[in-house]
Structures are given as C-alpha cells and as structure tokens.
C-alpha cells in the first residue's frame, strides 16, 4: 500500500480493509487475519465476530465486512444484526421466562416466535364469527347477521386477516 498523501489527515486515504498504521509512519496496512475495517480512515481494524454456540455463520468475515450470524435450528434472530438468538416455540405458544407456554383461551400465535395475540373481535366490525379461533389461528369473521337475511347475498368475502404483531383497535 502506498503512503497516504492527504494534507489534513494522512489516514483519511486509507481504504476499507486497511488501517492507518502509526507504527509504520502512518502507512495504510491491510487488516490482519480475523479482523476488518468497513470504512476508510480507520486507525485500527475490528476483530471479526465469532458465530458459534447458538449462532452459526451466515457469511464469513472479510477484510472489509464483519461476519454475519444467524441462529441454529430451534432458535431465531432478535435485534440488529442478529445480536441475540431466541428459542422457537410451537405455533399456539409464546416464550415466557419459564419457557414455551400455550396461548391462553381467546389468544393465538400462528408463528414460532412472538407473543399470543387476542382473537379479532368480529362484532366490533359489525360481523359475526364464521370460523372459531384456536391457539394457532385467529377467528375468521363472516358477514354480519343482517347480511344473512333472506334475499341478501352471502358471498361477502371475510375481512382480511390482521397483520402479525398488530392488536385489534
């Protein structure tokens, strides 16, 4: 690597994947093995992340980017950059401090992560329950009782399912 020539900061020309080596008269030196610098002008390289234990390597480290981790089977990522792995539960359960617990009556979880959420209250939309809810599935709302009066069409499509993570208003 050439000696940097910047008049302000001689380190500013050191590209990603290198560091400005004060021990070598501020020459841009490549990051040592198992380290990286993702931006230019760095005075040190950061040690690569180890994806082990409950983590697995999704992408190995390079001189310009940190390793990326995901989680071993039975766990899922939480936090920015998969900073934590959280245990999966079965559908119809949620994770508590004491482990996976079944959803209480009137709530459901259709994923292996997240919390149990209340069934949709069909009557709030003036509709009736077409299909009962379970621990794993929300209720399906159908047409309102008035819509089912003689001569009324009964092919009204059910209300769209709520997005995961949203509670009823």
């Amino acid at each position: 690597f050439e000696r940097t020539r910047s008049l302000q900061d001689p380190c500013s020309n050191c590209p990603a994947g290198t560091f400005c080596d004060n021990n070598r008269n501020q020459i841009c030196s490549p990051c040592p093995p198992n380290s990286f610098s993702s931006a230019g002008g760095q005075r040190t390289c950061d040690i690569c992340r180890q994806c082990k234990g409950v983590f697995r390597t999704r992408k190995e480290c390079s001189s310009t980017s940190n390793a990326e981790c995901d989680c071993t089977p039975g766990f899922h990522c939480l936090g920015a950059g998969c900073s934590m792995c959280e245990q999966d539960c079965k559908q119809g359960q949620e994770l508590t401090k004491k482990g996976c617990k079944d959803c209480c009556f009137g709530t459901f979880n259709d994923q292996k992560r997240g919390i149990c959420r209340p069934w949709t209250n069909c009557s709030l939309d003036g509709k009736s329950v077409l299909v009962n809810g379970t621990k794993e599935r929300d209720v399906v709302c159908g047409p309102s009782p008035a819509d089912l009066s003689p001569g009324a069409s009964s092919v009204t499509p059910p209300a769209p399912a709520r997005e995961p993570g949203h509670s009823p208003q």
């Epitope: 093995p33 198992n34 040690i47 180890q50 994806c51 082990k52 697995r56 390597t57 999704r58 992408k59 190995e60 390079s62 001189s63 980017s65 990326e68 995901d70 089977p73």
Partner: antibody
Framework: EVQLVESGGGLVKPGGSLRLSCAAS????????MNWVRQAPGKGLEWIAR??????????YYADSVKDRFTISRDDSKNTLYLQMNSLKTEDTAVYYC??????WGQGTLVTVSS | DIQMTQSPSSLSASVGDRVTITCKAS??????LAWYQQKPGKAPKLLIF???SLETGVPSRFSGSASGNDYTLTISSLQPEDFATYYC?????????FGQGTKLEIK
C-alpha cells in the same frame, strides 16, 4: 439440520491420486469458509486445508505436510467441497473429515495409501 | 506456526472426579481456542469455543478458562460418558493447530 457427508476414500498406491468430496446441506454454503482435517490411525487431529468463500476470493491455505500435493476447491452450485490428493504417500493414510465453523464435522472417509 | 502443547497426554480418573486438561499456545491466539471430545470411530465434538464459551447442548460440567496463553478444560464431576480423548485447537492463525490430545481413562 447441518449435514456434511464425505466420500471418495479408498485404497490407493503410493504416488497415486484420489479426490474426496464433501456434500454440505443445512446451512448457507457459498458464503462460508470450509476446512479439511485428517486423523491418522491411532494419532491426533491435523488441520490440512482451508478454502474461503467468494467474498474472500476463494483464498486457499494448506498445511506444510500437504502443500503442492493437495488442492482444496469448491463448487458452490453443488454445495460441495473437494480435496484433490496427488503424489500420495503412506503417511497420508488417515480418516479425512470436512469441517465447518469448528462445530460441524462429517463422519469422515478413510484413505489408505499402501502398496 | 503456533504450537499447542497439551497436557497430560493421558489421565486416569474415576466417576465423580474433577479433571483438568491444559493447553499452552506458543503465541497469542486472542482466545480463539476450541476444545473437542472424540470417541473411537467418531468425529470430534465441539465442547468449548472462544476459550470459555460452552457449545449449545454441552453439559454445564464442562468449562473452559484462559490465562494469558494458557488454556484449561475442566470437567467438574466426571460421568461415565466422559471417558474419551480431548483435543484443544487454535483457530486464530493459519495453519490451525491442535494439541496432541489427552486420553481420559477409567481408573
């Protein structure tokens, strides 16, 4: 579930060649580095080769004991790791393991070099 | 190359005993050290990574510690299934190197 399955071992004469394969599944193969480690009968473990992924230009590294005789390679489209072994010596007799991330190992394939 | 000097090479102990195995690195490895257990005819099994972190699913009687370039694997109370050969490995610097192994036998 991560699986590493080695194949290609067998009996070969000194000076001969053999190509080992390791079929990988259950993880993202093409962005990960991979290793070959061997174990001679009744002996300890010896790391012999490593290949990095595309982001590291498929860089390869070898133990001195196999340098210039063995070649590690990979086919990311097939999720397969290879070890081409040439000019084999009797001291290359060993179980050969492919390895990912220290935690994951294949069952091993036995290579016997004997006249 | 970094040499990993493992001791003892063999060890006799009884069920319930506390056992320690040590590995000394000839140079700095930044705690990038793994401990493995291997049983005859089987692949090595990772026990400890990063010198002190327990691999998922490994019993808590196994632990690792580090002091400078000296590394220790401790089994707090030996169980019948723990009789095996143990290896340390540094994965900081290529060539990656293993200790010579410690064969743990029943007394």
């Amino acid at each position: 579930e991560v699986q590493l399955v080695e194949s290609g071992g067998g009996l070969v004469k000194p000076g001969g060649s053999l190509r080992l394969s390791c079929a990988a599944s259950g993880f993202i193969f093409n962005t990960n580095a991979m290793n070959w480690v061997r174990q001679a009968p009744g002996k300890g473990l010896e790391w012999i080769a490593r290949i990095r992924s595309k982001i590291n230009n498929y860089a390869t590294y070898y133990a001195d004991s196999v340098k210039d005789r063995f070649t590690i390679s990979r086919d990311d489209s097939k999720n397969t790791l290879y070890l081409q072994m040439n000019s084999l010596k009797t001291e290359d007799t060993a179980v050969y393991y492919c390895n990912w991330d220290e935690a994951y190992w294949g069952q091993g394939t036995l290579v016997t070099v004997s006249s | 190359d970094i040499q990993m000097t493992q001791s003892p090479s063999s060890l006799s102990a009884s069920v319930g005993d506390r056992v320690t195995i040590t590995c000394k690195a000839s140079d700095h490895i930044n705690n990038w050290l793994a401990w493995y257990q291997q049983k005859p005819g089987k692949a090595p099994k990772l026990l400890i990574f990063g010198a002190t972190s327990l691999e998922t699913g490994v019993p808590s009687r196994f632990s690792g510690s580090a002091s400078g370039n000296d590394y220790t694997l401790t089994i707090s109370s030996l169980q019948p299934e723990d009789f095996a050969t143990y290896y340390c490995q540094q994965y900081w610097s290529i060539p990656y190197t293993f200790g010579q192994g410690t064969k743990l036998e029943i007394k």
